[in-house]
């Protein structure tokens, strides 16, 4: 049975640049050599979130008893293929990408749930899922048709941190303003009542006749 792709020991690529020219892409995808083919399915289109996060499922039809699987995400744009990220995992274990990778993922049976983060509009492109059954033999290789990921940058708006600083400054200003206003008002009131004196309460007759039987206390200062 022929295989789509290449055997890694036969055509070890120099990934220093991590970019493959179009001719190599053709070789990678269409020349049948050295391994068994495997079907890989992935969604046709995915829209990234406003935070630049895109998730999709990569499912492979495992023909053998794989215990070690390698998953690679390739990005095809402008006739070039770039390796986005790659991870090798043991069946039943978690998928672990490098610490600096923009990818995260989980595996469940023959499914790999991939998440790519930090995407911007310029990262829009076809993201191809490549699955290799590394161990035990035989070596299987499967390449998906790709998931077109659309990334739309959100409308430019002020930085949220900057807004918080403005809000904090305005709040602080208002607080100190009200504090000063209160202090000034109190000081003025106290000035009107000075010098401080002592006094006595006396009962005075009411001015209104209908209130004859009621007496209102009134404060009279005594010098």
């Amino acid at each position: 049975m022929a295989c789509l792709g290449f055997q890694r020991h036969k055509a070890q690529l120099n990934l220093a640049t991590r970019t493959w020219p179009c001719t190599l892409l053709f070789f990678l995808l269409f020349i049948p050599v050295f391994c068994k083919a495997m079907h890989v399915a992935q969604p046709a289109v995915v829209l990234a979130s406003s935070r630049g996060i895109a998730s999709f499922v990569c499912e492979y039809a495992s023909p053998g008893k794989a215990t070690e699987v390698r998953v690679t995400v390739l990005r095809q744009a402008d006739s070039q293929v770039t390796e986005v990220c790659a991870a090798t995992y043991m069946m039943g274990n978690e998928l672990t990408f490098l610490d600096d990778s923009i990818c995260t993922g989980t595996s469940s049976g023959n499914q790999v749930n991939l998440t790519i983060q930090g995407l911007r509009a310029m990262d829009t492109g076809l993201y191809i899922c490549k699955v290799e059954l590394m161990y035990p033999p035989p070596y299987y290789l499967g390449i998906g048709n790709g998931t077109q990921i659309y990334v739309i940058d959100p409308e430019p708006c002020p930085d949220s941190d900057f807004l918080l600083w403005i809000l904090a400054a305005v709040s602080s200003g208002l607080f100190f303003y009200s504090f000063l206003l209160t202090a000034v008002s109190l000081s003025k009131m106290l000035k009107k009542r000075s010098p401080l004196t002592t006094g006595v309460y006396v009962k005075m007759p009411p001015t209104e006749p209908e209130c004859e039987k009621q007496f209102q206390p009134y404060f009279i200062p005594i010098n």
């Epitope: 049975m1 022929a2 295989c3 055997q7 890694r8 020991h9 050599v33 050295f34 391994c35 068994k36 053998g64 008893k65 215990t67 070690e68 043991m90 039943g92 590394m134 161990y135 035990p136 033999p137 035989p138 070596y139």
Partner: antibody
Framework: EVQLLQAGAVLARPGTSVKISCKAS????????MNWVKQRPGKGLEWIGM????????SLNQAFKDKAKLTAATSASIAYLEFSSLTNEDSAVYYC?????????????WGQGTLVTVSS | DIQMTQSPSSLSASVGDRVTITCRPS??????LAWYQQKPGKAPKLLLY???NLADGVPSRFSGSGSGTDYTLTISSLQPEDFATYYC?????????FGQGTKLEIK
């Protein structure tokens, strides 16, 4: 140093069962598939099957599906081959062999073999 | 299952001779083939893997070639220690079958 150690010889009666062992050392036992190969006197090599010790997943040659049982004890790094309902046809040398993880693949380490003699 | 047809089954040769052993699988192996040497009372020893790759510690007089359904093991100049039985094996899906062997004897 990778080593696969097997018992030298086993004598068994027809109709009984025999369980032979392969003690692995010098590598991570649970990450390699272990194979068993049969060789009758003066004959060629026959692949019996293989086991992945971490989860005891096995792949058996259909010619041995009712005859062989593969097991593994991960704590002791030992792989076992059990042959049941023994007949004279089962008299042979049985080898354990590890599959290398490098592609292209091959059996990179072999045990020295266990001679099973079925005789009444 | 893939059948491995190895020929000849036995071969007589002298020290210094060039010897060729062939292995023909029943289907394309895409070079996923290994060659082993076995001496009496010993376990098989790997000679070549991936049809053409020489295993560590194996003398350069051993070489492998072939692709598809036709593979060859060549010993360029036979040495006394080379008289043994040789097996080809595929690892192109289970069962991993072996050829029936070629017994190389001293003429």
């Amino acid at each position: 140093e990778v080593q696969l150690l097997q018992a030298g010889a086993v004598l068994a009666r027809p109709g009984t069962s025999v369980k032979i062992s392969c003690k692995a050392s010098g590598y991570s036992f649970t990450t390699y598939w272990m194979n068993w190969v049969k060789q009758r006197p003066g004959k060629g090599l026959e692949w019996i099957g293989m086991i992945h010790p971490s989860d005891s997943e096995t792949s058996l040659n259909q010619a041995f599906k009712d005859k062989a049982k593969l097991t593994a004890a991960t704590s002791a790094s030992i792989a076992y081959l059990e042959f049941s309902s023994l007949t004279n046809e089962d008299s042979a040398v049985y080898y354990c062999a590890r599959i290398g993880r490098r592609n292209p693949y091959y059996f990179d380490y072999w045990g020295q073999g266990t001679l099973v003699t079925v005789s009444s | 299952d893939i059948q491995m047809t190895q020929s000849p089954s036995s071969l007589s040769a002298s020290v210094g001779d060039r010897v060729t052993i062939t292995c023909r699988p029943s289907e394309n192996l895409y070079t996923n083939l290994a060659w082993y040497q076995q001496k009496p009372g010993k376990a098989p020893k790997l000679l070549l893997y991936g049809a053409t790759n020489l295993a560590d510690g194996v003398p350069s007089r051993f070489s492998g070639s072939g692709s598809g359904t036709d593979y060859t093991l060549t010993i360029s100049s036979l040495q006394p220690e080379d008289f043994a039985t040789y097996y080809c094996q595929h690892l192109w899906g289970t069962p991993f079958t072996f050829g029936q062997g070629t017994k190389l004897e001293i003429k």
